[in-house]
């Protein structure tokens, strides 16, 4: 039984060219985190594994960079780079949990950060 | 370098049990997931079965789920795959792959044929 | 199950040709989708993962492209050592799925 929930930064704002931390956490529940797959709509951003560390995919190493914890640092935002972002934690033994963030990338210079929310 | 060799294939009766073994070398075997992958004479590839790095969890595929168990041992960089109850579909190429992320497999061995015929 | 569906099973092309092999999946996998070369008695070898990164010491030439269901493989400039049957291959989710092949023979 899947009792785990993850907690992420929720809807987020940043300013065009600067840069934002996308972090998730998974609570409630013993369950190993054995993989933590960072996407953006359809595409795979990072890959943080247990064992092997952090992959980035190659389109992205300019801008994304591992870290902290768990979470993904993007840099030199643009307006292309608004849109969802997800989460998804492999777990042993319970499976997997997806978490989901919306970031949007302000040519303005006013970016609030939103209320933190959680996914069960 | 990385090299996976697998071996213990052979000819075997419909009904009888075979198990493959595939020796790693070059990297840290028990930091990557593997697969078992298999090919029949003339056709494509089919996925058999994969297992984690500390053996904690396995999938298979529905064709040989209850008759295949995919194993490892870590401290003999080894990975295994019991085959009980073969039938004559099941003639085929294994090849042993590993799993960097489970996203893609991106070192194969060079196969050992199973032909399960009477 | 994901049903990866490639086309075309066969092509006939001339070295120095543009190629491209296309691979529909059944259900949206994201880019979790690799591109596989296989030559006569040989092992698999890995191309492209996560639908566009080229693996290590594959040549330029090739390139991966698409997500959700829809990904093609372009070989810019086909060369003979190219002349093999190409695969797709999914990760999303497990059972994993092949594509049924793409054969290029020479013209």
């Known amino acids: 039984m899947m009792t785990g929930t993850i907690e992420t930064t929720g809807n987020i704002s940043a300013e065009k060219g600067g840069s934002i931390i996308l972090q998730c956490h998974l609570s409630s529940t013993t369950a190993q985190v054995t993989q933590v797959n960072w996407e953006q709509q359809d595409q795979l951003l990072a890959i943080c594994n247990a064992d092997l560390g952090w992959h980035i995919s190659p389109s992205f190493k300019d801008r994304v960079a591992p870290g902290p914890g768990l979470g993904l640092t993007l840099q030199s935002l643009t307006v292309n780079d608004t849109g969802e972002y997800f989460c998804i934690y492999h777990t042993y033994p319970d499976g997997t949990y997806t978490g989901r963030i919306f970031l949007e990338v302000l040519e303005s210079s006013v970016a609030e950060h939103g209320a933190r929310f959680q996914i069960p | 370098e990385v090299q996976l060799l697998e071996s213990g294939g052979g000819l075997v009766q419909p009904g009888g049990s075979l198990r493959l073994s595939c020796a790693a070398s070059g990297f840290t075997f028990s930091s990557y997931s593997m697969n078992w992958v298999r090919q029949a004479p003339g056709k494509g590839l089919e996925w058999v079965a994969n297992?984690?790095?500390?053996?904690?969890?396995?999938s298979y595929a529905d064709s040989v789920k209850g008759r295949f168990t995919i194993s490892r041992d870590n401290s003999k960089n080894t990975l295994y795959l019991q085959m009980n109850s073969l039938r004559a579909e099941d003639t085929a190429v294994y090849y042993c792959?590993?799993?960097?992320?489970?996203?893609?497999?991106?070192?194969w061995g060079q196969g050992t044929l199973v032909t399960v015929s009477s | 199950d994901i049903q990866m569906t490639q086309s075309p099973s066969s092509l006939s092309a001339s070295v120095g040709d543009r190629v491209t092999i296309t691979c529909r999946a059944s259900q949206s996998i994201s880019s979790y989708l690799n591109w596989y070369q296989q030559k006569p008695g040989k092992a698999p070898k890995l191309l492209i993962y996560a639908a566009s990164s080229l693996q290590s010491g594959v040549p330029s030439r090739f390139s991966g492209s698409g997500s959700g269901t829809d990904f093609t493989l372009t070989i810019s400039s086909l060369q003979p050592e190219d002349f093999a049957t190409y695969y797709c291959q999914q990760s999303y989710s497990t059972p994993l799925t092949f594509g049924g092949g793409t054969k290029v023979e020479i013209k």
């Open positions: 297992i984690k790095s500390s053996g904690s969890s396995t």
């Open positions: 792959a590993r799993g960097p992320y489970d996203v893609w497999m991106d070192y």
